[in-house]
Amino acid sequence: FAATFYDIETLKVIDEEWQRTQCSPRETCVEVASELGKSTNTFFKPPCVNVFRCGGCCNEESLICMNTSTSYISKQLFEISVPLTSVPELVPVKVANHTGCKCLPTAPRHPYSIIRR
Amino acid sequence: FAATFYDIETLKVIDEEWQRTQCSPRETCVEVASELGKSTNTFFKPPCVNVFRCGGCCNEESLICMNTSTSYISKQLFEISVPLTSVPELVPVKVANHTGCKCLPTAPRHPYSIIRR
């Protein structure tokens, strides 16, 4: 809207910044136990994993950056049950990895992002 | 803890995953208006900017990943006042960019992260 008032280079820099902030899958650190839902006797090592999750800005305040497509990545983690009656078990934990994002009007209720095998 | 029970390659993959989730400055999208504090009649274009902010996991659940050093990056943004009585003004907005992070025991109350010039 202000193309006539500012030099093209400044506008280009601003536009590039805006593009980089747009709603898209971004690498995020998630805590496994929190994602699984609270359990007092089951812990994971490492407690956190890296996955892609939707994040960033939308053009309108009323829109929310949401996932439209999801793949599940299998992470090998040690599952520790308390009290520790056996050797910590190496288990595959499937973690939601957002592959597509879109600015949507309302936030549907979030399903659990982790599937245990 | 389970070095004797699992092959070294599996343990190496798990360890690398853990290292990548550790508390460190990560590129983040922040909404300028929210950071500045709510104002009903002033908007920014673009509304979001990319900066580095502390994020990730700590070695203890009771610790929080917090910034220990901060630089301020100047971002050129259009400031729009509503009702639109004049041309949107290009203003420099200084945004906090976390350059150092540490896992700290408690979260001090967060000061505003943006300085207006």
């Epitope: - | 070095a3 853990w18 203890e60 009771s62």
Partner: antibody, heavy 118, light 112 residues
Framework: QVQLAQSGAKVKQPGASVKASCKAS????????MYWVRQAPGQGLEWMGY????????TYNQKFKGRVTMTTDTSTSTAYMELRSLRSDDTAVYYC???????????WGRGTLVTVAS | DIVMTQTPLSSPVTLGQPASISCRSS???????????LHWLQQRPGQPPRLLIY???NRSSGVPDRFSGSGAGTDFTLKISRVEAEDVGVYYC?????????FGQGTKLEIK
């Protein structure tokens, strides 16, 4: 299995410094904070501080600030605790202890007895 | 600093009988994340301390089920359902919600 092997007993003069070591094995050294706790003869436990071996970040008990330095050598999975300007009331067993992610010092070394006497 | 006060300081018990140790903190131990970082340690004579219970009620690896922890906020209890000879030693409560981490002064458990 997890083991924390600490250096042997030391006798020091008042005003001197002592450096205790703690060699960790059986787990990923950088994935757990290492605490240092001391116990004077016949007394209770006193927390000195901890180090995050991943990045070397330290948090010290204010009581020891300026006198204590905690370091690690990740290549040998060893933690060190140096205490300077020793006084007779620093005579104690100095323990290193690994802290679990979910809280609590879950593995302890056998301790290093430091005697400060002239 | 958070002051941890244990009672009693000495507890003579009969083998096979229950024992209870109380620990009170000068401030709430509920962390901003909702967890309570109150732990119990056992120190047998001539040994380093050993973690018995963490986060109020979770038994550590290899700890017999006769040990149990309970409590909330500022008041916590360690219970031994049936005392055995190997339980003799000093018991400490400790907190890792606040810095500095602090310990109770210890409770000496001895056999009558």
């Amino acid at each position: 299995q997890v083991q924390l092997a600490q250096s042997g007993a030391k006798v020091k003069q008042p005003g001197a410094s002592v450096k205790a070591s703690c060699k960790a094995s059986g787990y990923t050294f950088t994935g757990y904070n290492m605490y240092w706790v001391r116990q004077a003869p016949g007394q209770g436990l006193e927390w000195m501080g901890y180090i995050d071996p991943y990045n070397g970040d330290t948090t010290y008990n204010q009581k020891f600030k300026g006198r204590v330095t905690m370091t690690t050598d990740t290549s040998t999975s060893t933690a060190y605790m140096e205490l300077r300007s020793l006084r007779s009331d620093d005579t104690a067993v100095y323990y290193c202890a690994r802290t679990s992610y979910y809280g609590g010092m879950d593995y302890w070394g056998r301790g290093t007895l430091v005697t400060v006497a002239s | 600093d958070i002051v941890m006060t244990q009672t009693p300081l000495s507890s003579p018990v009969t083998l096979g009988q229950p024992a209870s140790i109380s620990c009170r903190s000068s401030q709430s131990l509920v962390h901003s994340n909702g967890n309570t970082y109150l732990h119990w340690l056992q120190q047998r004579p001539g040994q380093p301390p050993r973690l018995l219970i963490y986060k109020v009620s979770n038994r550590s690896s290899g700890v017999p089920d006769r040990f149990s922890g309970s409590g909330a906020g500022t008041d916590f209890t360690l219970k031994i359902s049936r005392v055995e000879a190997e339980d003799v030693g000093v018991y400490y409560c400790s907190q890792s919600t606040h810095v500095p981490r602090t310990f109770g002064q210890g409770t000496k458990l001895e056999i009558k």
